[in-house]
């Protein structure tokens, strides 16, 4: 909020606190203030000031303790490399402005690792990775000198150590000391030097957090006791057997504030959703804290592995619960976690040493009572027998992630608490809660989950194809006959599922255009595979001009699709992916999926339509209960079907029916929607249950969707459960895991 001269509840006057070129906002009910500068600028000499008991604001002091009269917004610079070993960088300058570039070159005999070119970003950090010139001779690779740090130690033999330092006024994040370990890995994590104005961008946090959260072990599973050198792509193994506990620890103190607390809850709900999407069921512990901790969910509770139930508990937590005791006692909160980890009578249960523990702490990093929480982390490490046995240090069994939110974050405190692991980041500092929410939205979409079906990026910044990443546009160019438009759905890296009636037997592959992800370019087609039972002229003799039974086709692409945020598959029924998406047990049968997705009632579903170049979701109800018969009977109103005596001649068991006005007035499909998916949206995932085939009424004459449509305007869709043998046969090499 922009500053106002209303006197804060504290006793400090706002006179003379203005900042040149920026504004300020009050925090902690006027006990602190934060200077806010435009993008690309930072507050000099400090970002925050506190109201002292004497009634004056803390002094404006520079890093070398000189007093400044007035705060000002200064342009952000990126630090220069203090040292660069075995090579040169250019251009050399005492400081670099935003968007300046530097490039690195190695001397002969040395090879460059990391980024050869780096750009100074708006947050004062360099893009890319640390550039390192290495001759490959050391037992460990050269660990490099992250820009802004200084390194002591230049030998990389087994058990050699290097130490890092920051210039005065900067805080070291990561490991100050790293040791060359067996197998050629370095202990700890790469350091960096942080200025108080530096924040991690949501994208940086999402990438770093998730690459750590989901890194999978290639090689021996950690429970086979792998040694310190066997760092083969560490993970938190999201172990499908469920031997994993995740402790969510949420700061509810005064300094966090109510809106931030609500935002943090949203983030954790997204995290639970994310982890559930992997088809694993960790146990959750849930703690909020201020002066005292409050345990809302214990890992020992029967429902602690039920993601929906845990989410419900989380949503019911109120910021006001800590209002009367609103200090920040992080130590006590972590002791609550310790108490959940430890076992009664000190007798470890069977399998205790195979359970992985993940602590996710969201805080402003300002513990002001109870003592140093790092001592509890040490106790937890002791309890889990971590770091005690050199041959099997068990570091994989504990991960502590700390998310520091806001300007008051104490970087030293949060860095001390977080785990430090090679090539991973466990400590994050974000500007505000909106940024942290961004992180968790982006996280739901990281690359590890790109192959997961039916996942979308529901973020406010998402485009149409972020929200419908499976949607494919199909057009068939027929010389002298114009062109036919249809929709389809990406079901695997090589196949798009659509309607057979979009094509004729004369259509050549080169005349069929398919585009996905909103991209302009068309994809090359190898072949169109029709369902063998589809025959549009199959009942002409019986006076039925067009017969749409088995109206499904698969378009096989020449080249593999590259999944990304705007291109990814929808879930198909009776696949392992759908079992996981619906969070059903791995033993779930096809019939059980059918009961879950298509129960005998009105089923809320959706289809995607293009209106004025925009994709929009249309909510409809599949009539699968008592309204099914009347829905199907309305097919007689379709052009050419008025003479049909028995409607089951045209509406075979292969069809699902939507449309009409009960229970709600359903929107109808248009011609161009044919072939698109009919979708059931469950547990934040999208499962295709049908393919749009035909409609009773053309509600889209003259390119405009009519508002008023008759009650008999129904749409018919091929039920995918009825064409599974064909899907299974044609998609057998696509790794979809049909049940």
């Amino acid at each position: 909020t922009p500053w106002s001269l209303a006197r804060p509840q504290g006793s400090c006057s706002l006179e003379g606190v203005e900042i040149k070129g920026g504004s300020f906002r009050l925090l902690q009910e006027g006990q602190a203030l934060e200077y806010v500068c435009p993008s690309g600028f930072y507050p000099y000499p400090v970002q925050t000031r506190t109201c002292r008991s004497t009634g004056s604001w803390s002094t404006l002091k520079t890093q070398d303790q000189k007093t400044v009269r007035k705060a000002e917004c200064r342009a952000i610079h990126c630090p220069r490399p203090h040292d660069f070993e075995n090579g040169e960088y250019w251009p050399r300058s005492p400081y670099y402005n935003v968007s300046d570039e530097i490039s690195f070159h190695c001397y002969d005999g040395y090879t460059l690792r990391g980024s050869a070119n780096r750009t100074c970003q708006v947050n004062g950090r360099w893009s890319g990775q640390t550039a390192i010139c290495d001759n490959g001779a050391g037992y460990c690779s050269n660990p490099g000198i992250p820009i802004g740090t200084r390194k002591v130690g230049s030998q990389y033999r087994l058990e050699d150590s290097v130490t890092y330092h920051c210039s005065r006024g900067l805080t070291l994040r990561g490991s100050q000391r790293r040791t060359c370990q067996e197998g050629g890995s370095w202990s700890g994590t790469e350091p960096s030097c942080q200025d108080s104005f530096m924040y991690d961008t949501p994208q940086e946090v999402a990438e770093a957090f998730l690459s750590s959260l989901t890194e999978t072990i290639e090689g021996v599973d950690a429970e086979d006791g792998h040694g310190p050198g066997e760092q083969q792509k560490r993970k938190i193994v999201l172990d499908p057997s469920g031997s994993m506990n995740i402790y969510l620890v949420l700061d509810g103190s005064d300094s966090i504030g109510a809106s931030n607390f609500t935002g943090a809850k949203k983030c954790l709900v997204n995290l639970i959703e994310k982890v559930a999407s992997y088809g694993v069921k960790p146990r959750y512990g849930l703690v909020t804290y201020a002066t005292y901790p409050k345990i809302w969910v214990k890992v020992s509770e029967a429902d602690s592995s039920n993601a929906d139930w845990v989410t419900k508990q989380l949503n019911e937590i109120n910021y006001e619960d800590h209002k009367l005791k609103s200090g920040t006692n992080t130590k006590k909160a972590l002791q609550a976690v310790y108490s959940m980890m430890s076992w009664p009578d000190d007798v470890p249960p069977e399998g205790w040493n195979r359970t992985r523990h993940v602590i996710i702490l969201m805080t402003d990093g300002l513990h002001n009572m109870g003592g140093d929480p790092i001592t509890v982390i040490d106790e937890i490490r002791d309890l889990l027998y971590i770091g005690k046995d050199r041959k099997n240090p068990r570091e994989d069994y504990l991960d502590v992630y700390v998310f520091g939110v806001g300007p008051l974050v104490n970087q030293v405190n949060i860095n001390a608490l977080a785990s430090k692991k090679d090539n991973e980041q466990h400590v994050f500092k974000v500007k505000d809660m909106e940024n942290l929410e961004d992180v968790f939205y982006q996280m739901i979409d990281e690359s590890q989950s790109l192959s997961l079906c039916g996942m979308v990026w529901e973020h406010r910044k998402g485009t149409d194809y972020h929200k419908q990443p499976w949607q494919a546009k199909i057009s068939v160019i027929r010389p002298s006959k114009g062109h036919e438009s249809c929709m389809g759905a990406v079901v695997s890296e090589y196949f798009v599922l659509t309607a057979a009636h979009c094509f004729t037997v004369d259509d050549k592959e080169h005349s069929i255009k398919v585009s996905v992800g909103g991209e302009k370019r068309d994809l090359e087609i190898e072949v169109v595979l029709f369902h063998p039972n589809y025959n549009i002229n199959g009942k002409k003799e019986a006076g039925i001009p067009e017969f749409y039974d088995y109206d499904v086709a698969l378009i096989k692409l020449k080249n593999k699709l590259k999944y990304g945020q705007t291109i990814r598959p929808i879930c198909l029924p009776c696949t392992e992916g759908t079992t996981r998406a619906l969070r059903l047990p791995p033993t779930t049968t096809c019939q059980q999926q059918k009961e879950e997705l298509l129960p005998a009632q009105d089923i809320k579903a959706l289809f995607v339509s293009e209106e004025e170049k925009k994709l929009t979701r249309k909510e409809v109800y599949i009539k699968n209960g008592d309204k099914k018969g009347s829905c199907e009977r309305d097919a007689q109103y379709a052009p050419g079907y008025d003479k049909v005596k028995d409607i089951s001649e045209v509406v075979t068991p292969r069809f699902l029916c939507t449309g009409g006005v009960s229970p709600y007035a359903d929107p109808n499909t248009c011609r161009g929607d044919s072939g698109g998916p009919l979708i059931v949206h469950k547990r934040s995932r999208f499962i295709q249950v049908g393919v749009i085939s035909w409609g009773v009424v053309d509600v889209c004459k003259n390119q405009k969707r009519q508002k008023q449509v008759p009650a008999h305007a129904r749409d018919f869709h091929i039920n995918l459960f009825q064409v599974l043998p064909w899907l299974k046969e044609k998609l057998q090499d696509e790794d979809l895991g049909f049940l």
């Epitope: 001779a137 037992y139 690779s141 990389y156 087994l158 066997e230 792509k233």
Partner: antibody, heavy 120, light 113 residues
Framework: QVQLVQSGAEVKKPGASVKVSCKAS????????MTWVRQAPGQGLEWMGW????????KYAQKFQGRVTMTRDTSISTAYMELSRLRSDDTAVYYC?????????????WGQGTLVTVSS | DIVMTQSPDSLAVSLGERATINCKSS????????????LAWYQQKPGQPPKLLIY???TRESGVPDRFSGSGSGTDFTLTISSLQAEDVAVYYC?????????FGQGTKLEIK
């Protein structure tokens, strides 16, 4: 040029100790780890451990822990390996070896070997 | 401990012919980050200390003739002598330095047929 010269052959009784020396020349002694490897008659090679002559820090193979002591005297550029509580299966040729400056794991230079015979 | 197993135990090859010695480790000695295999080959002639031939599984030590080459990755490695010379008669050892204790193979004795 780099040279590692070891002390002469020894005959010891079971339960006794032996101390083998390795004198280095032709390079800066404290810059390189010194490793000890042994080879029983007609058998393969066995890594025993190393010493960092600069700090005096040692790393021993678990098998020899408690029986082996590696020391150095930087003033005369000499490394020592002492093995106590000798048994007959300790009869072997004991080698000192030096790695590279950057990587102590590749044994580029070796002493000529010292035969230690343990016999009652 | 990582166990190194060489095959064959002994090998007789005619002069000028190719000799191949295999080495298998009980677990991978490849560092997946720096893509290096922590493996070396040594040659030992009777009455002499061993001599370093190959390190990083395929890098030839300076002064070693180019008829010697190393290959393989992960758990399976090969030392090849492309054209056997009389002076190559020796015992050859592979060694892993991925985990402590560093361990050697049992050796392969190479003779002339």
């Amino acid at each position: 040029q780099v040279q590692l010269v070891q002390s002469g052959a020894e005959v010891k009784k079971p339960g006794a100790s032996v101390k083998v020396s390795c004198k280095a020349s032709g390079y800066s002694f404290t810059d390189y780890y010194m490793t000890w490897v042994r080879q029983a008659p007609g058998q393969g090679l066995e890594w025993m451990g190393w010493i960092n002559p600069n700090s005096g820090g040692t790393k021993y193979a678990q098998k020899f822990q408690g029986r082996v002591t590696m020391t150095r005297d930087t003033s005369i550029s000499t490394a020592y390996m002492e093995l106590s509580r000798l048994r007959s299966d300790d009869t072997a040729v004991y080698y000192c070896a030096r790695g590279y400056y950057a990587n102590s794991a590749w044994f580029a230079y070796w002493g000529q070997g010292t035969l230690v015979t343990v016999s009652s | 401990d990582i166990v190194m197993t060489q095959s064959p135990d002994s090998l007789a090859v005619s002069l000028g012919e190719r000799a191949t010695i295999n080495c298998k480790s009980s677990q991978s000695v490849l560092n997946s980050r720096n893509k290096k295999n922590y493996l070396a080959w040594y040659q030992q002639k009777p009455g002499q200390p061993p001599k370093l031939l190959i390190y990083w599984a395929s890098t030839r030590e300076s002064g070693v003739p180019d008829r010697f080459s190393g290959s393989g990755s992960g758990t399976d490695f090969t030392l090849t002598i492309s054209s056997l010379q009389a002076e190559d008669v020796a015992v050859y050892y592979c060694k892993q330095v991925y985990n402590l204790p560093w361990t050697f193979g049992q050796g392969t004795k190479l003779e002339i047929k």
